[in-house]
């Protein structure tokens, strides 16, 4: 990635390392208003499998791994990058390694969820004051789930799939700050690990995955007002491990495994007319990304 | 019945490359991450490399890291194990192996396929 | 790498003896241990899974214990079809690792 400054522009999809061949350390930015990508600074160690997201305008990369030919490394980095700058700077890191991590924030803290570290899948939750500077841990999940995908909507947070170890899985979970608990909530329509999980509309998406056997095109909408799954349109690329993410009322998943290649498409889903479309591709197939836009 | 045969193994001088294919049939690849495991004569057993089915993410041991690359084609149900720049010391009966009701112990097994490398 | 130190390296027996084979990992692995049974120009064959757990179709005379960092694996009436070279493995943490062996043979 280049080191001079990044162009002071308005929302744009931020994708952070992955994984072709090795981890990556790519940080890359793509500009829905224009089609175009920019190339910026570099991760300061390459990682796949980890989460991106967004708090105060400044991008953080979590977890993951750092899977190379010299070895292989779960990483607890919380790592915060100012797109003002185009540099990152190390936080403090979480209580233990999270490759395959879940993430999603609540009134400005960011929860960490869920992943492994070698062979122990966790179960256990973190919470992170970007103020303070501190993790701390909260209620742990009510299963151990990496490969998770999270998403947040009025300020519950939602666990939904994964794999705990033995089974990939279709059930979910939610979790209230306010008490500290888990609850478990309707289980999706299809086992789903390494899917793509986002809020769009009130309803939670969760697209694509792993069910254990095939990846997945198929996507699925939870309402939380009437607790059931339901089907909309499948993407054009069935994928795993893909980057996800909301953009002015659209869902964009980015990559990911297909089975057989790294996937370099990104589509783009529009609710009104259910329906996916191809939008760009990015400047190499990879899975694991870490993906998320930065505010207004 | 569950079946993996490997196919490929043969004599290669030092400098060379090999390609092991391991054919699966009774259950899908694409259910399961696939590991090469190695026996040189006489001697123990050491784990090659090995491919995830959900991530398409690769591991290595370090004395073939850079040299031998996993792979896999669901649609042919097969999984790979390209050699290259091969040594007098990758000598050994390669094994394909699958961990199926335990992620962390491989139940299939391969009859295994003999590698030479050797002027 | 987390070394899988196996003992005794080779040990003879008698059939209906009670076999004892130990591992010991050289930092915690958990319960991510395996056992294998190897016969002479054959592959390996699983007997033991997550240290304890027996393999469908494994007879109950095998069984798997863990203490700490020390893995047992005991044939508790060796029968002839036994004789072979058992192998442990560590999955816990990358890269996987063997043990070097223990050769059980006719006393």
């Known amino acids: 990635g280049s080191m001079g400054h990044a162009p002071k522009v308005g929302r744009l999809i931020y994708t952070a390392g992955g994984y072709f061949r090795q981890s990556l350390s790519y940080l890359e930015a793509y500009n829905p208003s224009d089609g175009t990508w920019l190339d910026l600074a570099d991760l300061q160690v390459p990682r796949s499998g980890l989460a991106g997201c967004v708090v105060g305008g400044l991008l953080y990369a979590v977890g993951g791994r750092n899977n190379s030919p010299d070895g292989n490394t779960d990483s607890s980095a919380l790592d915060c990058y100012n797109p003002m700058t185009n540099q990152w700077s190390p936080c403090a890191p979480m209580s233990v390694p999270r490759n395959r991590i879940g993430v999603g924030v609540i009134d400005g803290h960011i929860y960490a969820v869920g992943g492994s570290h070698g062979c122990i899948h966790h179960n256990s939750v973190e919470r992170y004051e970007p103020e303070r500077d501190e993790w701390h841990l909260v209620a742990p999940m009510l299963t151990r789930r990496i490969g998770v995908g999270v998403a947040v909507l009025n300020r519950l947070l939602y666990a939904v799939g994964g794999f705990d170890g033995t089974n990939r899985l279709n059930s979910a979970e939610c979790y209230y700050p306010e008490r500290n608990e888990w609850r478990m909530i309707t289980a999706m329509n299809t086992i789903r690990s390494g899917a793509g999980v986002c809020v769009l509309h009130n309803c939670i998406y969760a697209a694509g995955g792993y069910d254990g056997q095939d990846q997945l095109n198929s996507v699925e909408r939870y309402d939380v007002e009437t607790e059931t799954w339901t089907f909309v349109a499948p993407m054009k690329h069935r994928r795993s491990a893909l980057g996800i993410t909301v953009h002015q009322g659209r869902i964009y998943v980015l990559g990911g495994y297909d089975g057989h290649t790294f996937l370099d498409s990104v589509e783009c889903y529009d609710p009104d007319t259910d329906t996916w479309s191809e939008v760009t591709r990015m400047t190499s197939g990879r899975s694991g990304v870490g993906v998320a836009v930065t505010m207004e | 019945e569950v079946q993996l045969v490997e196919s490929g193994g043969g004599l290669v001088q030092p400098g060379g490359s090999l390609r092991l294919s391991c054919a699966a049939s009774?259950?899908?690849?694409?259910?399961?991450?696939i590991h090469w495991v190695r026996q040189a004569p006489g001697k123990g057993l050491e784990w090659v490399a090995s491919?995830?089915?959900?991530?398409?993410?690769?591991l290595y041991a370090k004395s073939v890291a850079g040299r031998f690359t996993i792979s896999a084609d669901t649609s042919k149900n097969t999984a790979y194990l390209q050699m290259n720049s091969l040594r007098a010391e990758d000598t050994a009966v390669y094994y394909c192996?699958?961990?199926?009701?335990?992620?962390?112990?491989?139940?299939?097994w391969g009859q295994g396929t003999l590698v030479t490398v050797s002027s | 790498d987390i070394q899988m130190t196996q003992s005794p390296s080779s040990l003879s027996a008698s059939v209906g003896d009670r076999v004892t084979i130990t591992c010991r990992a050289s930092?915690?692995?958990?319960?991510?241990v395996a056992w294998y049974q190897q016969k002479p120009g054959k592959a390996p064959k699983l007997l033991i899974y997550?240290?304890?757990s027996l393999y469908s179709g494994v007879p109950s005379r095998f069984s798997g214990s863990r203490s700490g960092t020390d893995f047992t694996l005991t044939i508790s009436s060796l029968q002839p079809e036994d004789f072979a070279t058992y192998y442990c493995?560590?999955?816990?943490?990358?890269?996987?690792?063997f043990g070097q062996g223990t050769k059980v043979e006719i006393k």
């Open positions: 009774g259950f899908a690849i694409s259910a399961s991450s």
């Open positions: 491919i995830d089915p959900e991530t398409g993410e690769t």
């Open positions: 493995q560590q999955s816990y943490s990358f890269p996987s690792t």
């Open positions: 997550s240290a304890s």
């Open positions: 930092q915690s692995v958990s319960s991510a």
């Open positions: 192996v699958a961990p199926r009701v335990d992620l962390y112990a491989a139940d299939a």
